[in-house]
């Protein structure tokens, strides 16, 4: 299973649920579905309040039980380490795959943290991060921001991923804007 890691804003906007959590248990395999579940302890929720309704405490995250079908394998054994998890809700359960955005909270830049807590949501409605995978790239709409990180040092470590968000400048126009300048 291979996929290009998304821009964090894309991960935020395309997810039903975005939380901060610790992985606290050994994974278990459910025999009925052949999904594995990880026990988590949620510390913050950034997106999904309406989708979850009253059941706002997520205790498990589910993923396919095999790598070849995009199952997520959690490699850290540090149960006190917090992770940003962006996933989909299926039948009220949080699902992630290899392609989901799952990252140690401490590995995120201050700008990315700001994005997840406040700013990315502003760009979800109108704006689209448009990946440029090979040159030449053309903007297909004024609401697209051209994401060129992959052409340089790798998508997650690039400047646009770590410091910028695609936000509305005026109706019908979105541009890259610095998240650093918005940090108090």
């Amino acid at each position: 299973c291979t996929c290009v890691p998304p821009h964090p804003q894309t991960a935020f906007c395309n997810s039903d649920l975005v939380i901060r959590a610790k992985f606290v248990g050994t994974p278990e395999v459910n025999q009925t579905t052949l999904y594995q579940r990880y026990e988590i302890k949620m510390t913050k929720m950034y997106k999904g309040f309406q989708a979850l309704g009253d059941a706002a405490d997520i205790r498990f995250v589910y993923t396919p039980a095999m790598e070849s079908v995009c199952g997520y394998f959690h490699r850290s054994h540090n149960r006190s380490e917090e992770f940003l998890i962006a996933g989909k809700l299926q039948d009220g359960l949080l699902h992630i795959t290899t392609c989901s955005f799952v990252a140690p909270w401490n590995s995120l830049s201050l700008a990315q943290r700001r994005g997840f807590t406040k700013t990315y949501t502003v760009g979800c409605e109108e704006c689209t991060v448009f990946p440029c995978l090979s040159i030449p790239c053309k903007l297909q709409s004024g609401t697209h921001c051209l994401w060129t990180d992959q052409l340089l040092q790798g998508s997650e470590k690039g400047f646009q991923s770590r410091h910028l968000a695609c936000l509305p400048r005026e109706p019908g126009l979105c541009t890259w804007q610095s998240l650093r300048s918005q940090i108090a």
């Epitope: 395999v29 025999q31 009925t32 095999m66 394998f73 490699r75």
Partner: antibody, heavy 113, light 111 residues
Framework: QVQLVESGGGLVQPGGSLRLSCAAS????????MSWVRQAPGKGLEWVSV????????YYADSVKGRFTISRDNSKNTLYLQMNSLRAEDTAVYYC??????WGQGTLVTVSS | DIALTQPASVSGSPGQSITISCTGT?????????VSWYQQHPGKAPKLMIY???NRPSGVSNRFSGSKSGNTASLTISGLQAEDEADYYC??????????FGGGTKLTVLG
């Protein structure tokens, strides 16, 4: 008590097909993932395939992917393994197993011309 | 393609204790608590002796015990008896290949 009984083994020519069945009793069949495991003569155990309890997910060993198909009929408490494009190296005793615990007695599949 | 490493053979005298090791990786033995041990007598189906690392199914003698440390699981048989002579296989859930087995260990009871 819990029981698994395999059937359908036999002699088949290379390139041929065979369908194995496994009749289950003594447990709630649709609550358990089921596997096929094989053992070539004088060799160790090799996992072949698994199917989830509800039949929605199936996984295969690389050695059989694209040739074998696992399926189940929960209304009949029966597990199946459809084996196509059989090769000499598929010769083995095939065991039906409840995920990680109960095994059947096995059925011998011989692929030879 | 053997994924888990077991010694090819071990031996012991009646009454002794023996231990069979099973070494894997963090994606199988080390990452999950799904390690099983099977006993297989010639011409018979494998019989589950230990599941979930250290649990014994009902009907299995308490002379059989299992444990795990890191990426290595172990089966210990105490008070060895003649009927313990058999092949022993470890098995683990594996994230990459779903299910993997060791190559098997032939246990010989001397005398």
């Amino acid at each position: 008590q819990v029981q698994l009984v395999e059937s359908g083994g036999g002699l088949v020519q290379p390139g041929g097909s065979l369908r194995l069945s496994c009749a289950a009793s003594g447990f709630t069949f649709n609550s358990y993932a089921m596997s096929w495991v094989r053992q070539a003569p004088g060799k160790g155990l090799e996992w072949v395939s698994v199917i989830s309890g509800n039949g929605s997910n199936t996984y295969y060993a690389d050695s059989v992917k694209g040739r074998f198909t696992i399926s189940r009929d929960n209304s009949k408490n029966t597990l199946y393994l459809q084996m196509n494009s059989l090769r000499a190296e598929d010769t083995a005793v095939y065991y039906c197993a409840r995920f990680l615990d109960i095994w059947g007695q096995g059925t011998l599949v011989t692929v030879s011309s | 393609d053997i994924a888990l490493t077991q010694p090819a053979s071990v031996s012991g005298s009646p009454g002794q204790s023996i231990t069979i090791s099973c070494t894997g990786t963090s994606s199988d033995v080390g990452g999950y608590n799904y390690v099983s041990w099977y006993q297989q007598h010639p011409g018979k189906a494998p019989k589950l002796m230990i599941y979930d690392v250290s649990n014994r199914p009902s009907g299995v003698s308490n002379r059989f015990s299992g444990s795990k440390s890191g990426n290595t699981a172990s089966l210990t048989i105490s008070g060895l008896q003649a009927e313990d002579e058999a092949d022993y296989y470890c098995q683990s859930y594996d994230f990459i290949r779903f299910m993997v087995f060791g190559g098997g260990t032939k246990l010989t009871v001397l005398g």
